[in-house]
Amino acid sequence: KIDACKRGDVTVKPSHVILLGSTVNITCSLKPRQGCFHYSRRNKLILYKFDRRINFHHGHSLNSQVTGLPLGTTLFVCKLACINSDEIQICGAEIFVGVAPEQPQNLSCIQKGEQGTVACTWERGRDTHLYTEYTLQLSGPKNLTWQKQCKDIYCDYLDFGINLTPESPESNFTAKVTAVNSLGSSSSLPSTFTFLDIVRPLPPWDIRIKFQKASVSRCTLYWRDEGLVLLNRLRYRPSNSRLWNMVNVTKAKGRHDLLDLKPFTEYEFQISSKLHLYKGSWSDWSESLRAQTPEEEPTGMLDVWYMKRHIDYSRQQISLFWKNLSVSEARGKILHYQVTLQELTGGKAMTQNITGHTSWTTVIPRTGNWAVAVSAANSKGSSLPTRINIMNLCEAGLLAPRQVSANSEGMDNILVTWQPPRKDPSAVQEYVVEWRELHPGGDTQVPLNWLRSRPYNVSALISENIKSYICYEIRVYALSGDQGGCSSILGNSKHKAPLSGPHINAITEEKGSILISWNSIPVQEQMGCLLHYRIYWKERDSNSQPQLCEIPYRVSQNSHPINSLQPRVTYVLWMTALTAAGESSHGNEREFCLQGKAN
């Protein structure tokens, strides 16, 4: 009922709570002497559904049959209208339209941990739109029945708030949930389980790892578990991997030896627990333990290469280069590299430890036979040394690879191809392809890159440290015993026309011809490998086409003579540079007038 209803009553038949689709009769009746003063037959009773007028009647009462009410709550209000006055509220009623509860489905119960509480979930089915009470009931041994009621409006979860104990782990319990509202009731199918079925252990905790004698091969994982745990599963992986290694263990009692861990690797470990071989469920995975395994002495051998440079008649410079061991070979933090240089006939040896670099340069006599050995050391020991004899890598002309070419192969790759040397190709033990950025000064500080190729290969794709629009000097070495032959070529992965032309810095006259000198184009403006320079000239103030001279590009060249100029004529000269992609813009213009006689 709404408000005090002093003036009259609203009654609802058959009930204030009805099934969707049902019809209700609503009666509004005035109490004695509560109609319009003096004109009781003028009483006009009006029935409102919310704010909408749906019926009216003159007299002391009004009857209305209402159908098609929607799910939920509908408010009806009865008002009295008298002549010359506002409508007066008489009384009202709420009608609740809903449905009987559907059978709850998929009832399932779980207890999280041996000390946890039993909680059950289910699916309610469609909304009843009415106050519906859910009662969760659990029947167990000793003829006992536990139950709890749900006070929430949408109830699909209930926690008993108490704990099942393992005193009879195989005893059966049967759960059932019953939904009741004004229109009916329905119970779920029973769900029967034992303690072992519903207790989901807490994840293991306090996970630790120990390496006996700081060795990766003697590793034990320790953890703590709830008392009844029978099974564990362990998973572990290197921190940079997505794939887990899995191990199942029974009656581990909080420890397990791991035998297949890699040295000097950060691993992530997790553990899960279960109470019974085939009953119940696995716990959540424990929090991760992250731990680094100890170092072991390096395996594998360094890949070493070298470069020789003539200094003078008695001395030569040797630059040694080596590549870092892979993580799996280094098996620890490399603390230093040990380089030993030995003159093989005299037996003199010099050893040096190098930290922070993967190269070493020294000066040795040009006489004698020299060998080097390089090894990598971590806290546990050293790798096997890589030994190489220092020789003149390009001395054997007959071992030089033939028809070397370098072609761009996609983004930042160069495909180098060659033909075996003329000399017996089967004598080749391996090819080495070496590349470095081309610097006009022949700078020895420019990083050197190399890769080794099997003797039956006649191509190699180079991609390491290759940048677009940079020219590389590429050498292919064929090695056979203590001999080597080489061929070289320039190559780039991507090219375009140079951004500028050479800058003419001087023009000098020599015996009737001129010598033009220029500054090299800065490397970053060359935009690939230069193929040619062009020198252009024309008479000043002339509109004729310029003449030109094309010079093949050579790294060290920066001057060229021209002998086809007329004396006492002023010429304008300029230069351009070309890559395979095209010609640069003009360099600077210089004027020159030849004084002497033409040849």
Partner: nanobody, 125 residues
């Protein structure tokens, strides 16, 4: 100090009803499990009903549907409504209180720390 005092016992005809009450002082009933036990002459004390601190009720199947346990936090009391009484319900009824958090423990006498003196219920045929 904790005290439990039962009331509401008496004589009643078979089929009748009684409402027993247990008033508690010294501890809030909302924080504890509350139980009712009974002992008939010459028999062992037996479990009748209990209510956990989390509002889970437990009954033996022999009384389920006839007996209801409820808590009145405002009065710091627990009630036992008994309907359709039978002569075999004749016994001294005891109220008990304890910090019990397990299903099985709610029906076990030795889990309850505090006990009342009991109230007599007699059902005649």
């Amino acid at each position: 100090q904790v005290q439990l005092q039962e009331s509401g016992g008496g004589s009643v005809q078979a089929g009748g009803s009684l409402r027993l009450s247990c008033a508690v002082s010294g501890r809030p009933v909302s924080d504890y499990a509350m139980g009712w036990f009974r002992q008939a002459p010459g028999k062992e004390r037996e479990f009748v009903a209990a209510l956990s601190a989390s509002d889970t009720t437990v009954y033996p199947n022999s009384v389920k549907g006839r007996i209801t346990i409820s808590r009145d936090n405002a009065k710091n009391a627990v009630d036992l409504q008994m309907n359709a009484l039978k002569p075999e319900d004749t016994a001294v009824y005891y109220c008990a209180m304890g910090p019990i958090g397990t299903f099985q423990g709610l029906a076990r006498q030795n889990e309850y720390h505090y006990w009342g003196q009991g109230t007599q219920v007699t059902v005649s045929s």
